[in-house]
C-alpha cells in the first residue's frame, strides 16, 4: 500500500470541494435532513442479484465450477454448498417477487461458467442458455427491463487454473469472446449492460487480502495487475459493443464501480480533506479516473505506486477513456467491511450517499448515474421483520432524492440490493441482504417479503416520499384567554433576602484604615424599610427573564422539602413560603399568572422531605397524608393568587427512581395517584369555592409510532406504550377509576407465563370512587414521538413488562439528546386523549427541545414554530379545548441537555424573540391579521362587565 504523506496534490477533478462546502447545513431545514418530494418522472426503479449469490445449482445441468465454488470448498467454512435461494430452479418465484415490488428493471448477472463451463466460448451449455432466455423473456413479458451484468465475480475455475485468473492478460480476450456471445444471444432483449461488478473488490480482496476468490494475498503488484486487466477487459468489451452491437441493439453499457465514503476529522483542515480525497481516489478513482476521467490512474496513485501500478500508454488511455455510457455506482456493505477494504487515511468512514454522489458529480463532470447497488445488511437471524433495513433504505433513498433535487446530481435509476437473501461472499450465510426472506433449509425456498420489500414497493408506487402525517401549516390564532407560558422546574427558595442595606440602620465607611474592611460610623442611625420581594436576588433575575419572555403564565414548582423540612406541619418554613408568595405577587404585577406545581420529582432527587424519604417515600401509603397536609398549607398560603395547580409533575416517570422491581414502581405510582386524588378532593371541597382555581397532575406524554408500520406487533407495541405510559394514570383519573384493562391483562398474562412476577395494584372501592374524575384538565408534558417495536423481555421491571424497544429513525431531525422533532405526534396525542378520555380542557404544560447552541438556537425556534402550529391545528381543526402552551424551559441546568431559553448563567438565546413573536401574534395570524386580543371583540357590554368585576 502507498505511503501516507501530506503534500498538497493537484487532482484533475474537483471532488474535494464537497468537503469544503459548508458542512454545518442549517439544522432545521428539514429538506436537508429529509426531503418529502418525488423522483423525476420515469425514474428507473430496480432491484438486483448476483448469479453466484442466488442461483444455487452449482454443478447442475452441466454448469462448470467457478472460482467461488472452489473458494467455498477450500477457504470458507460453509456447512452446505446447496444453501442459496436456488433461483436457477425457482425462477417463477423470483418473477413473483419482482411483480410484488413493481420495479421497472431487474439487474442480474450471468454466470460465465453456467454458459461456458470451461470459460472458453464454444458451444454454450444448453440448460444454462435456456435459463437465461426464459428469465429475459419473462421479464419483458412483465415490462421489466433487464439490466445484465456479465461478470459478478464468478470466473470459471478452469481459467483460474489454466491462466492464473485476472493476473493474466489472456483473460481480456476470453472475456470479450464471452461478452460477444452474450450480446449476440441476448442483446436484442437487453438495453443495459454492465461489464464487471465492482472490479475494485475483485482485485483488492481476490488478490490482495485473500478474503474473496481466488483467495490470493500478499502480492501488491498482482492486485494492480488484476485491476489493470479488468479495466482493459471492460474497455475492450465497450468498444466491441459500441462498434458491433449498439448501432442495431441501441443499448447502453457501463461498469459498476463501488466505493465507501469518508469525512475529514476536522472539516476545516486542508490536510484532512486531502486525505479524504486520497482515500476516495485510491478506491473509486482507481477505476473511475481511467474510464470517466482522463484515461489514466489518479495522479496520487501513479506517484505513490510507481513500482507496482502498471502504466497506460497514450493509446491505451485514449482507448479506456469514456468507455461508459453512464456512471454505474455501487454503495453497500462490501465497500465498508471489513475495515481493510479501503484506505481510511485516519479519517472517518461515513454512509452519506448524497455526499459521494456529489463527489462523483464534481470529480467526473456530472455524469448520468445509475445506482447499480445500494442497501445494507441484517443479521442472519432476522427474518421478515427487518426494521433497521427500512431505516437504512429510507435514509439512502432520501439522500439520492436530495442529491437529485437539491444538488442537481443526474441520478436516473436506483437498484435496491438485493432481491433475495443469498450467499454473501466472505460472510457466507451469516448476513442477509434480501428484500425477500428465504429459508435456506426449506425445500421450496419460498420468497417472503420483508418489511423492506413493503417499504420499497411503497416508495416505487409513490415515486418518492409523501408526508402522510403532517397537514399544511395553518394561519390562525388561539383564543384571547390562551395561556402562553414558560416552565421552570423547582425554584429553590432563598433563605434570606439578599439586600441587607435597608434592614441594617448603621452607616459604614470602607477601607478607612487600609485594611479593606467596613467600619461602622458610630452615632449615626439610618432609616430602614421593611423587606420587599425584590430584595430576593433570584426573584429579580426571574422577573427580568420572564419580562423578556413576554409570557402570560409562569409554571414553576415549589420545593416540598424546603417548605416542610420535617414532612409534617410541626415545622413550617415561613421564609420559603414568603419567597414563593413573592415570586407569585411580583409576577402578577407584570401580568404573569402562575401555574404552580406542588411536587416535582427528578431522577436524581426525589424532592421529598428527608423524614418521608427515610420512611419509604412513595412506597409508604401514609406519604399521601403528608402530601395532603403540605398541599393544604400551600392552598391556604398561596391559593388566593394561584388559579392553576399541578399536584405532581410526571408521576409516570417515577419508575426511573422506584425501579428495584416493577412492584415497587407500581406501588409508588399507586400511592402517588391516591395522593393526587386526595389533594384534588381537598381543593375541590375546601378551597375551590373561594379560590376558583383548577387542579390536575402533569403526565409525561410522548407519542408513539410503530417503528415498522408493516408489522402488526409494532402497532400493538405503540398502543401498549401509550397504555403503560399515559393511560396508566389517565384511565383511573379521567375514565374508570381503575388501571387500563389492556395494561392489567398484559401484565397478568406475562406473570402467568412466568416472564414476570409483576402485579398491578388494585383499587379498593373507596379508592376507585376517590380517583375517578379527580382532575380538572389534561396537563401534558410532550417532547417527542418515540418509534417503538415489540420485543419480549423477561424480568420484573416496569420497562420490561411493556415488551417495548425504542428505535431511532436516522432520517428524522433530532436533537443532540436524540429527541426526534415530530410535531404531528403532538396532534395525534391530543386527539387520542380526547377520543379516549373526553373533551376536557388541555394545557401543554411542557414542550421543548435541547439545542446545543448557546445563542442562535435555530433548532429550538423551528421546534417551537412547528409544535405550536400543531397545537393551533388541534384547536382550529379538531376543536380541542387547548387552553395553554408552556415552553420548556426557562433556564438550563449546568451539564444537562440544553433545554433553556436562557443559559445557566442567564444569557438570553435568540429563540426568546421568536417565542415573543408567537405570543404577541397569539399564533399565526394571516397577513391582514385577525382581531387583536387587547381590543374588545364584538361584545359592547364587555367593558361594563369588566367594570363590575
Amino acid at each position: 500500500d502507498y505511503k501516507d504523506d501530506d503534500d498538497k496534490l493537484d487532482f484533475p477533478g474537483d471532488g474535494r470541494a464537497v468537503w469544503s462546502q459548508n458542512p454545518n447545513l442549517s439544522p432545521v431545514n428539514e429538506s436537508q435532513l429529509f426531503l418529502y418530494d418525488t423522483f423525476p418522472k420515469n425514474f428507473f426503479w430496480g432491484v438486483g442479484t448476483g448469479a453466484f449469490q442466488v442461483e444455487g445449482s452449482w454443478k447442475k445441468d452441466g454448469k462448470g465450477l467457478s472460482v467461488w465454488d472452489h473458494f467455498i470448498a477450500t477457504h470458507l467454512n460453509v456447512s452446505s454448498r446447496d444453501g442459496s435461494s436456488d433461483s436457477y430452479i425457482f425462477l417463477e418465484k423470483d418473477l413473483s417477487a419482482l411483480d410484488f415490488l413493481g420495479v421497472s428493471f431487474y439487474q442480474f448477472s450471468i454466470s460465465w461458467p453456467r454458459l461456458f463451463p470451461d470459460g472458453t466460448v464454444a458451444v454454450a451449455n444448453a440448460k444454462g442458455l435456456q435459463y437465461y432466455n426464459r428469465l429475459l423473456d419473462s421479464l419483458l413479458l412483465r415490462n421489466i427491463e433487464p439490466v445484465v451484468t456479465l461478470y459478478h465475480w464468478d470466473l470459471p475455475w478452469a481459467l483460474q487454473e489454466k491462466y492464473g485468473g485476472w493476473k493474466n492478460e489472456t483473460l481480456i480476450d476470453l472475456f470479450n469472446d464471452y461478452a460477444t456471445y452474450c450480446f449476440q444471444t441476448f442483446g436484442d432483449r437487453v438495453k443495459y449492460w454492465i461489464t464487471i461488478h465492482n472490479p475494485y473488490l475483485v482485485a483488492w480482496h481476490g488478490y490482495g487480502t485473500g478474503l474473496h476468490a481466488p483467495g490470493e494475498k500478499g502480492n501488491v503488484a498482482a492486485v494492480y495487475t488484476v485491476g489493470h486487466n479488468l479495466l482493459k477487459a471492460h474497455s475492450k468489451v465497450w468498444h466491441n459493443y459500441n462498434r458491433n452491437f449498439r448501432p442495431h441493439q441501441k443499448g447502453w453499457l457501463s461498469i459498476t464501480l463501488g466505493s465507501h465514503w469518508i469525512e475529514p476529522n476536522r472539516a476545516e483542515s486542508i490536510v484532512d480533506i486531502l486525505k479524504c480525497q486520497q482515500s476516495m481516489v485510491s478506491v473509486l478513482g482507481w477505476f473511475a479516473n481511467p474510464i470517466h476521467g482522463d484515461g489514466d490512474y489518479p495522479e496520487v496513485m501513479t506517484k505513490k505506486l510507481l513500482s507496482v501500478l502498471p502504466a497506460f500508454s497514450e493509446a491505451e488511455k485514449n482507448e479506456v477513456r469514456g468507455t461508459a455510457d453512464f456512471f454505474a455506482f455501487s454503495f453497500g456493505p462490501n465497500n465498508f467491511k471489513p475495515l481493510n477494504t479501503m484506505a481510511k487515511m485516519g479519517q472517518n468512514v461515513s454512509l452519506n450517499l448524497r455526499q459521494v454522489l456529489n463527489w462523483i458529480k464534481l470529480e467526473y463532470g456530472n455524469p448520468r448515474i445509475l445506482i447499480a447497488e445500494n442497501g445494507w445488511f441484517t443479521d442472519s437471524y432476522v427474518q421478515t421483520e427487518d426494521t433497521t433495513a427500512i431505516y437504512m433504505m429510507k435514509n439512502f433513498l432520501n439522500q439520492v432524492l436530495q442529491a437529485i433535487r437539491l444538488d442537481g446530481v443526474r441520478v436516473f435509476g436506483y437498484t435496491a440490493w438485493s432481491l433475495l437473501d443469498g450467499f454473501e461472499w466472505q460472510d457466507a450465510y451469516n448476513t442477509r441482504r434480501g428484500l425477500f426472506y428465504v429459508d435456506f433449509n426449506s425445500e421450496q425456498r419460498e420468497r417472503r417479503p420483508k418489511s423492506s420489500a413493503h417499504y420499497y414497493k411503497q416508495v416505487i408506487g409513490e415515486n418518492g416520499f409523501t408526508l402522510r402525517e403532517a397537514t399544511p401549516d395553518l394561519q390562525g390564532q388561539f383564543p384571547c384567554d390562551f395561556s402562553w407560558g414558560v416552565t421552570e422546574s423547582v425554584l429553590k427558595p432563598e433563605s434570606v433576602a439578599s439586600s441587607p442595606q435597608f434592614s441594617d440602620p448603621h452607616l459604614y465607611v470602607w477601607n478607612a484604615t487600609g485594611n479593606r474592611m467596613l467600619h461602622r460610623v458610630e452615632g449615626v442611625r439610618l432609616k430602614t424599610r421593611p423587606a420587599q420581594c425584590t430584595d430576593f436576588i433570584t426573584i429579580k433575575k426571574q422577573l427580568e427573564m420572564l419580562a423578556r419572555m413576554k409570557v402570560t403564565h409562569f409554571r414553576f414548582a415549589l420545593d416540598w422539602a424546603s417548605v416542610l423540612p420535617t414532612g409534617n406541619l410541626s415545622e413550617v418554613n415561613r421564609q420559603a413560603l414568603r419567597y414563593y408568595r413573592c415570586v407569585v405577587t411580583e409576577g402578577l404585577k407584570l401580568n404573569i399568572s402562575p401555574m404552580v406545581t406542588l411536587y416535582y420529582p427528578t431522577h436524581a432527587h426525589l424532592g421529598l422531605p428527608a423524614p418521608l424519604l427515610h420512611s419509604g417515600g412513595w412506597l409508604d401509603p401514609s406519604t399521601a397524608k403528608a402530601f395532603r397536609d403540605y398541599a393544604g398549607l400551600c392552598f391556604r398560603e398561596l391559593g388566593d393568587l394561584v388559579k392553576l395547580w399541578i399536584t405532581i409533575n410526571e408521576p409516570n416517570r417515577l419508575s426511573d427512581v422506584y425501579n428495584r422491581t416493577s412492584n415497587d414502581t407500581y406501588q409508588a405510582a399507586h400511592n402517588l395517584l391516591i395522593a393526587h386524588a386526595i389533594v384534588w378532593h381537598l381543593y375541590d371541597r375546601q378551597y375551590r369555592p373561594s379560590q376558583r382555581g383548577a387542579l390536575s397532575l402533569s403526565l409525561h406524554s410522548d407519542w408513539a409510532e410503530p417503528a415498522n408500520p408493516y408489522v402488526a406487533s409494532h402497532w400493538q407495541a405503540a398502543e401498549r406504550f401509550l397504555q403503560f405510559e399515559i393511560a396508566w394514570f389517565a384511565e383511573p383519573l379521567f375514565k374508570t377509576g381503575d388501571y387500563p384493562v389492556a395494561m392489567r391483562e398484559y401484565i397478568a398474562s406475562k406473570t402467568r407465563r412466568g416472564l414476570s412476577s409483576s402485579v398491578l395494584p388494585r383499587f379498593s372501592d373507596a379508592e376507585r370512587r376517590l380517583v375517578k374524575g379527580a382532575a380538572d384538565f389534561y396537563a401534558l408534558n410532550h417532547f417527542t414521538t418515540r418509534f417503538v417495536m415489540h420485543e419480549q423481555q423477561n424480568g420484573s421491571r416496569y420497562d420490561s413488562d411493556r415488551d417495548v424497544q425504542f428505535l431511532q429513525d436516522i432520517t428524522r431531525l433530532a436533537s443532540p439528546s436524540r429527541l426526534a422533532v415530530m410535531p404531528w405526534g403532538e396532534g395525534k396525542l391530543l386527539r387520542w386523549m380526547r377520543n379516549n378520555y373526553g373533551d376536557l380542557d388541555v394545557y401543554i404544560t411542557a414542550n421543548g427541545i435541547d439545542d446545543q447552541a448557546l445563542q442562535n438556537d435555530q433548532l429550538r425556534q423551528y421546534y417551537l414554530e412547528k409544535y405550536v402550529q400543531e397545537a393551533l391545528k388541534a384547536y382550529l381543526i379538531d376543536k380541542i379545548k387547548i387552553k395553554g402552551y408552556y415552553a420548556f424551559k426557562l433556564t438550563e441546568e449546568k451539564s444537562k441537555p440544553r433545554f433553556g431559553f436562557f443559559t445557566s448563567d442567564f444569557k438570553a438565546k435568540s429563540s426568546i424573540q421568536f417565542y415573543n413573536k408567537l405570543i404577541t401574534s397569539n399564533g399565526f395570524p394571516s397577513e391582514n391579521g385577525g382581531p387583536r386580543c387587547n381590543q374588545t371583540q364584538g361584545n359592547p357590554e364587555c367593558t361594563v362587565c369588566l367594570l363590575l368585576l
Epitope: D620, P621, S622, A624, K625, I674, A677, I678, H681, L682, R685, Q686, P761, R762, S764, D765, A766, E767, R769, L770
Partner: antibody, heavy 119, light 107 residues
C-alpha cells in the same frame, strides 16, 4: 386539633327514637366522610355505614337499613345518627369516626354514646 | 362480605414479652388493613393503616406485616399501657368489617 364530640348517653324505651350528635372541630367538616360504628356491650365493633359530608348522601350496611338515619347540619359541623323504633338489640355504644376518603381506616373517633333500651 | 378472623380472642402475656396477634381475611384484601387498640370505656385508637404504616404518635414497638389474606400485629416488648383489646379492620371493600378482637391480659 381535630376533635369529635358526641352527645351524652340516652336511656330509651323500646319503640322510641334516639338521636345522637357528633360535632366536629379542627378541620373542614365537609372534606371528610363521617362513619358510624356500633359496639354492643362486650362485643366487637360493627360498621354501620357512612355519610358523605359534602353531598349528604348516606350509605348503610344491610343490617342497618330501615330504622337508622344519618344526617348532617353542615353549618354546625355536626353529624347525626337517628335510631327509630328502638329495639333491645340496639342497646350499644355508638361511635362516630372520621375517615380519610376510605383509605386509611378511621384515625379520629368520638368518645362514644351509650344508648340503653329498657322497658 | 369479607370475614375477618382473629384466631384467639384473648391472650395471657407477661410484661416485656413479644406479642403477635394474627388476623385472617376470607379473601385477598390487598393490604387495606387497619389495626386498632381499645381500652375499656374508650374509643378505639388507630395504630396502623395499610397493613404496615404506623400512625403518628404510636410507639415504635408496634409494627404490622402481612399481605394477601394474612396479617399480623406485633408488639416487641409489652408495656403495661398496652393491655387492651386489639381489632383488625379491612377497608378493601364495602361493607367495612372488623375482626372480633384479641384481648391482652397480664399473666
Amino acid at each position: 386539633q381535630i376533635q369529635l364530640v358526641q352527645s351524652g348517653p340516652e336511656l330509651k324505651k323500646p319503640g322510641e327514637t334516639a338521636k345522637i350528635s357528633c360535632k366536629a372541630s379542627g378541620y373542614a367538616f365537609s372534606n371528610y366522610g363521617m362513619n358510624w360504628v356500633k359496639q354492643a356491650p362486650g362485643k366487637d365493633l360493627k360498621w354501620m355505614g357512612w355519610i358523605d359530608t359534602d353531598t349528604g348522601e348516606a350509605t348503610y350496611t344491610d343490617d342497618f337499613k330501615g330504622r337508622f338515619v344519618f344526617s348532617l347540619e353542615t353549618s354546625a359541623s355536626t353529624a347525626y345518627l337517628q335510631i327509630n323504633n328502638l329495639k333491645n338489640e340496639d342497646m350499644a355504644t355508638y361511635f362516630c369516626a372520621r375517615e380519610e376518603y376510605g383509605l386509611f381506616g378511621f384515625p379520629y373517633w368520638g368518645h362514644g354514646t351509650l344508648v340503653t333500651v329498657s322497658a | 362480605d369479607i370475614q375477618m378472623t382473629q384466631s384467639s380472642s384473648s391472650f395471657s402475656v407477661s410484661l416485656g414479652d413479644r406479642v403477635t396477634i394474627t388476623c385472617k381475611a376470607s379473601e385477598d384484601i390487598y393490604n387495606r388493613l387497619a389495626w386498632y387498640q381499645q381500652k375499656p370505656g374508650s374509643a378505639p385508637r388507630l395504630l396502623i393503616s395499610a397493613a404496615t404504616s404506623l400512625e403518628t404518635g404510636v410507639p415504635s414497638r408496634f409494627s404490622g406485616s402481612g399481605s394477601g389474606k394474612d396479617y399480623t400485629l406485633s408488639i416487641t416488648s409489652l408495656q403495661t399501657e398496652d393491655v387492651a383489646t386489639y381489632y383488625c379492620q379491612q377497608y378493601w371493600s364495602n361493607p367495612l368489617t372488623f375482626g372480633a378482637g384479641t384481648k391482652l391480659e397480664i399473666k
